[in-house]
């Protein structure tokens, strides 16, 4: 059997694992001492519950869901995490001035439960 990828949230709209955007300043992120730009980042992250087989990434996530129902104190529910990322370029301080650096795992692009 393969992992099912249910997209219906039984908890109600917006309650299950999804992409969420938070606007954050360099100060909010603790980056002000090494990043110069951008001064504000639209941080995309994965937030929400992972009930039943909702967006199960693989068979392991399905097993985790089943065992969590049986032994909630021992087995945690699957977690909502990025399935892929959007890259981002930062202008950052260096010993000699400034430079560009590309980060390929900074912003979530889409989410699943694992």
């Amino acid at each position: 059997a393969r992992a099912r990828n249910g997209d219906h949230c039984p908890l109600g709209p917006g309650r299950c694992c999804r992409l969420h955007t938070v606007r954050a300043s360099l100060e909010d992120l603790g980056w002000a001492d090494w990043v110069l730009s951008p001064r504000e980042v639209q941080v995309t992250m994965c937030i929400g519950a992972c009930p039943s087989q909702f967006r199960a990434a693989n068979m392991h996530a399905q097993i985790k869901t089943s065992l969590h129902r049986l032994k909630p104190d021992t087995v945690p529910a699957p977690c909502c995490v990025p399935a892929s990322y959007n890259p981002m370029v930062l202008i950052q301080k260096t010993d000699t001035g400034v430079s560009l650096r590309t980060y390929d795992d900074l912003l979530a692009k889409d989410c699943h439960c694992i």
Epitope: S37, P38, R39, N86, P87, M88, V89, L100, T102, D104
Partner: antibody, heavy 119, light 110 residues
Framework: EVQLVQSGAEVKKPGESLKISCKGS????????IGWVRQMPGKGLEWMGV????????IYSPSFQGQVTISADKSISTAYLQWSSLKASDTAMYYC????????????WGQGTLVTVSS | QSVLTQPPSVSGAPGQRVTISCSGS????????VNWYQQLPGTAPKLLIY???NRPSGVPDRFSGSKSGTSASLAITGLQAEDEADYYC??????????FGGGTKLTVLG
């Protein structure tokens, strides 16, 4: 509507100086980086450098470091590309382009400024 | 010589499917993303595909991008006369310089 409007074509002699401009409108000018791209006649695109108009931080491609200067005046939403001493090999079309939200691609482009350097 | 390698030209008849390749290395396409630009004759480049496979609004779904390993491809289906243009791929190299492919001239036959 996002627009980048560049200054008109220029014909210069070797050794002369030049400053071309790129005026942004329809968006918050200080919230997006501006890049400059060169296209020599019949050739491809070459990235020259980038400026953050909000903080005036500039970074140049090693190929163009020391050859040109990129600047911006945020009070009039305009970025600039300048040469102190032009060479015949600077003859090209120069484009300004706005970086997308993540700084990884160019989502809007100016119409280009043709610079011709000839004695 | 460009860091990213594209074929100088490709051609196809109206209605056909054509692909344009963009070959890089483990220091650019291999670990990062690819964007594609279309430059119609006498005009400025225009963003066609970003982050490998995303289309900006207004770009027809006849255009699609993909990436595998250190190569990327742009596919155009249902080729139209107005698709005749130069196409450029773009990524970054290991020192975070923005790099372009040499460009591919697409000719629509007929």
């Amino acid at each position: 509507e996002v627009q980048l409007v560049q200054s008109g074509a220029e014909v210069k002699k070797p050794g002369e100086s030049l400053k071309i401009s790129c005026k942004g409108s329809g968006y918050s000018f200080t919230s997006y980086w501006i890049g400059w791209v060169r296209q020599m006649p019949g050739k491809g695109l070459e990235w020259m450098g980038v400026i953050d108009p909000g903080g005036s931080y500039t970074i140049y491609s090693p190929s163009f470091q020391g050859q040109v200067t990129i600047s911006a005046d945020k009070s009039i939403s305009t970025a600039y590309l300048q040469w102190s001493s032009l060479k015949a090999s600077d003859t090209a079309m120069y484009y300004c382009a706005r970086y997308g939200r993540y700084g990884t691609y160019f989502d809007y482009w100016g119409q280009g400024t043709l610079v011709t350097v000839s004695s | 010589q460009s860091v990213l390698t594209q074929p100088p030209s490709v051609s196809g008849a109206p209605g056909q499917r054509v692909t344009i390749s963009c070959s890089g290395s483990s220091s650019n396409i291999g670990v990062l993303y690819v964007n594609w630009y279309q430059q119609l004759p006498g005009t400025a480049p225009k963003l066609l595909i970003y982050s490998n496979d995303n289309r900006p609004s207004g770009v027809p779904d006849r255009f699609s991008g993909s990436k595998s390993g250190t190569s990327a491809s742009l596919a155009i289906t249902g080729l139209q006369a107005e698709d005749e243009a130069d196409y450029y791929c773009q990524s970054w190299d290991s020192s975070s310089n923005y790099v372009f492919g040499g460009g591919t001239k697409l000719t629509v036959l007929g």
